[in-house]
Amino acid sequence: DLKVEMMAGGTQITPLNDNVTIFCNIFYSQPLNITSMGITWFWKSLTFDKEVKVFEFFGDHQEAFRPGAIVSPWRLKSGDASLRLPGIQLEEAGEYRCEVVVTPLKAQGTVQLEVVASPASRLLLDQVGMKENEDKYMCESSGFYPEAINITWEKQTQKFPHPIEISEDVITGPTIKNMDGTFNVTSCLKLNSSQEDPGTVYQCVVRHASLHTPLRSNFTLTAARHSLSETEKTDNFS
């Protein structure tokens, strides 16, 4: 009996540019002789329904149809036909099929590959055109994929040390697509510093599919109102 097992759950998630290993384990009733077996990996894009051959291994030869694609002959000996794809790109997401032939038997399995890119986040202070005692803080998230992202603002005061979500005076702009397929978005928080307690900690919280835990950027309101020079206006706050 010949059986193929892919990633549990049928989906693998990998970071953009990573060297991804798409799992495919072979279960066979006898020891595997790699010189008399064949492995073929196929890929079907998310946008087109056409299947494309990615890699082929048979007997004493292997061929990569995608640069760098490889199945390890040394791992194949112990039943591991996993496909290594170095420098994975967003457009390589989709369905991957592992087909194993041990004549006359044939088995196959499929897995969905999702490619994600984590956002980078930074805080900026924009005082241009703002009224006295008014500040605009911008939280820029860039280089993320997929497009769905959640940006919120929170504050902690000495009176209320637990974070409180801010819903007023928050404007989140549209997501902008970059040339490489990733996205950027900016969320703005308008503050009237005269109405806020010095020592209040504000946080921009970014949640995205690529992140295990939310990305947090914060600043603390000081007694003296912020007055940043032009160059400081693009600096990150810790």
Epitope: N19, T21, F23, N25, D60, H61, Q62, I70, S72, P73, W74, R75, K77, S78, G79, D80, S82, R84
Partner: antibody, heavy 120, light 111 residues
Framework: EVQLVQSGAEVKKPGASVKVSCKAS????????MDWVRQAPGQGLEWIGD????????LYNQKFRGRVTLTVDKSISTAYMELSRLRSDDTAVYYC?????????????WGQGTTVTVSS | DIVLTQTPLSLSVTPGQPASISCKAS??????????MNWYLQKPGQPPQLLIY???TLHSGIPDRFSGSGSGTDFTLKISRVEAEDVGVYYC?????????FGQGTKLEIK
Amino acid sequence: EVQLVQSGAEVKKPGASVKVSCKASGYTFTDYNMDWVRQAPGQGLEWIGDINPNNGGTLYNQKFRGRVTLTVDKSISTAYMELSRLRSDDTAVYYCARSEVFYGNYADYWGQGTTVTVSS
Amino acid sequence: DIVLTQTPLSLSVTPGQPASISCKASQSVDYDGDSYMNWYLQKPGQPPQLLIYAASTLHSGIPDRFSGSGSGTDFTLKISRVEAEDVGVYYCQQSKEDPRTFGQGTKLEIK
């Protein structure tokens, strides 16, 4: 920085078993196989076998088959080599080594070695 | 099993002079256009360290005075200018077939 840290020296009686551990750090544990190699006093290197941490698949040198068991614990990035029915000629330094398996096959990082002495 | 025979078994070299070690395999270690021959150096009291893999590729961090060549059954490790730190035992290893086997070792000492 890639590091392989092995357990300490062992003294065993003939017929007993020994289990050597190899804790890996500084790389993705499942991306490489773990080789085990031994070296008897004043002798050359002898390949025992290897294990694929991805699926637990093992390949053994026939010479040791039935006496050696290679295992891994992925959760703590640790590989183990257990040798049973020890004989005096099993006295050696036992090494674990990280093995590249996709773009060639070679051991690029080695543990410091574990001395196993079998004596009655 | 593939048997690897190294020659010479020992050599004594003056610093700055070249050195060469041969490794002959009992059968070809080539597969799909690549040669699965590796070279290691074991310095006294240390584990082996990788020098060359796939017959001729220098491992990262290894000085370029080391070079490897050959294919099929005949392989050579060359040191263009031997230095005091090169002392130890040099091993060839084939990784084409299991069991992976090593040569018996070549001991290099400084004159």
